[in-house]
Each structure stands twice: as structure tokens, then as C-alpha cells.
């Protein structure tokens, strides 16, 4: 898999995939934000 | 309503390798978990793994680990599946499929690949 | 990998007749979200899989409700109530909780 994430559950691999998202949403969010406030 | 649109019967030599798509209309494609699915001629179905399109991140069955290779391309909404080192055990129909609610609810219409040589 | 185990592998009921079948896993598929991801398909002849049951019990939205699941833990069971010409079908059991996801062998359904 690539990322290296590991779990057995599949239920438990589509938690980390909607962490990741909400994460990768939010780091997002801040990098627009520093970008227009330069 | 989701449909999902497979590429047509494949007929591939021992050995050789083979590219399956599966084109996703009516949904948001990056967002789901798109699986690929396979039945051999009278046969039961045997689960081959999955990708989620926004990462790209892909999960195989151990028994096809190293020899599969699932992508995705947003832009077109179609995930592929690739199978190398063919055999003729790996005749079969396979299915693209899109989860639900921790189910397949959605298969594509399935792609015919027969080994033969 | 978590082993499905069908019974019967066939199965011929009369019209109108219930028929029922089982399906039995390794371990239990109960997840940690309190969800139990154990699912039924229905494949008729040339065509792809269609899902009938989800969470063990959810029919899909469409499906009759002749059909319905039951069971928890690593004992289930698809019934169908009053057995329809269009039932004629292969049924598979599939568990959703553990990688590998795997399937049962299927049961072949036919009128008598």
C-alpha cells in the first residue's frame, strides 16, 4: 500500500483514509491562508 | 446513479500481461474506494484489492501481491487494473466495483480475459 | 484470511416455498464500530454480482423484502420468504470487516 498505512480492518483503513483527507483539507487550508496573507 | 463502464474481452499469451479500466460516471470518483473483483468460468468471486483515488493508495490481496497493480486517473474517472505474468488459471471475468456503506454496491458490467496460448 | 463457509451449495424449493441459506465465518465479524460487515449478492447468469444485504440485515434500497438476513457474530443466514421465478440465482456470502475481504462458494437457488 502507498503510504505505508497497515491495518486489518478494513473498516479501520477507510478511518485513516478520512483522517488523512480531513488533514490533508485543513494543512490545505493553512497553506492557502499563509500564501494570501503574504 | 453511479455507473461504471469496463474496457472490452481481453485474449493475452502465458506470460504476458494485461490492463483492465473501469471508466466511473455519476459520483465523485476521487472519494471512493474502487475494488476489483474476479470469477473464474463457474466459478465462485475472489477479491484481487482496492484503491481510494484521492491518494492513490491501494491495498492488494496477499495472493496477488506483486503481480497486481491498481491506478487511478481522476482527470478521466477510470481506475485501472493491471495483472502481470499471466496464467491460464487467471482466465476469469473481472469486475470493477465501488463500496458503499462498507459493501459493494455498484459493479461494473465485467471484462472478459482468457489466457490461452 | 477469513474462510466463508456456504450451505447448501444448492438449493431447489418450490414456488412460493421459503428457502434459506447459511453462511459461517472463521472469526467473528463483528467490527469495532459495532457494525457487522457480513453481505449478500445475488448473480443471475451473464450478468455482474448485485447486492442484496449489507450490515447483515440492510436490504438494498429496490430489493423485495421476501429477502431478508439475519445472524451476528460468524453465523448468518439469507431467507427468502416466498420463492420467485426471477430468484433463480447464485447467492454469495462476503465479509467486509477483515483484510482479505473474502467470499463465500455460493448457492445455487432453482425451482423444483
Known amino acids: 500500500h502507498s503510504d505505508g498505512i497497515f491495518t486489518d480492518s478494513y473498516s479501520r483503513y477507510r478511518k485513516q483514509m478520512a483522517v488523512k483527507k480531513y488533514l490533508a483539507a485543513v494543512l490545505g487550508k493553512r497553506y492557502k491562508q499563509r500564501v494570501k496573507n503574504k | 446513479e453511479v455507473q461504471l463502464v469496463q474496457s472490452g474481452a481481453e485474449v493475452k499469451k502465458p506470460g504476458s500481461s494485461v490492463k483492465v479500466s473501469c471508466k466511473a460516471s455519476?459520483?465523485?470518483?476521487?472519494?471512493?474506494?474502487m475494488h476489483w473483483v474476479r470469477q473464474a468460468p463457474g466459478q465462485g468471486l475472489e477479491w484481487m484489492g482496492l484503491i481510494y483515488p484521492i491518494f492513490a493508495d491501494t491495498r492488494y490481496a496477499q495472493k496477488f501481491q506483486g503481480r497486481v497493480t491498481i491506478t487511478a486517473d481522476e482527470s478521466t474517472s477510470t481506475a485501472y487494473m493491471e495483472l502481470s505474468s499471466l496464467r491460464s488459471e487467471d482466465t476469469a471475468v473481472y469486475y470493477c466495483?465501488?463500496?458503499?456503506?462498507?459493501?459493494?454496491?455498484?459493479w461494473g458490467q465485467g471484462t472478459l480475459v482468457t489466457v490461452s496460448s | 484470511d477469513i474462510v466463508m463457509t456456504q450451505s447448501p451449495d444448492s438449493l431447489a424449493v418450490s414456488l412460493g416455498e421459503r428457502a434459506t441459506i447459511n453462511c459461517k465465518s472463521s472469526?467473528?465479524?463483528?467490527?469495532?464500530?459495532?457494525?457487522?460487515?457480513l453481505n449478500w449478492l445475488q448473480q443471475k447468469p451473464g450478468q455482474p454480482p448485485k447486492r442484496l444485504i449489507y450490515?447483515?440485515?440492510t436490504r438494498e434500497s429496490g430489493v423485495p423484502d421476501r429477502f431478508s438476513g439475519s445472524g451476528s457474530g460468524t453465523d448468518f443466514t439469507l431467507t427468502i420468504s416466498s420463492l420467485q421465478a426471477e430468484d433463480v440465482a447464485v447467492y454469495y456470502c462476503?465479509?467486509?470487516?477483515?483484510?482479505?475481504?473474502?467470499f463465500g462458494g455460493g448457492t445455487k437457488v432453482e425451482i423444483k
Open positions: 462476503w465479509q467486509g470487516t477483515w483484510f482479505d475481504l473474502t
Open positions: 466495483a465501488i463500496d458503499q456503506d462498507g459493501s459493494f454496491a455498484y
Open positions: 455519476g459520483g465523485t470518483f476521487s472519494d471512493v474506494y
Open positions: 472469526q467473528s465479524l463483528l467490527d469495532s464500530d459495532g457494525k457487522t460487515y
Open positions: 450490515w447483515a440485515s
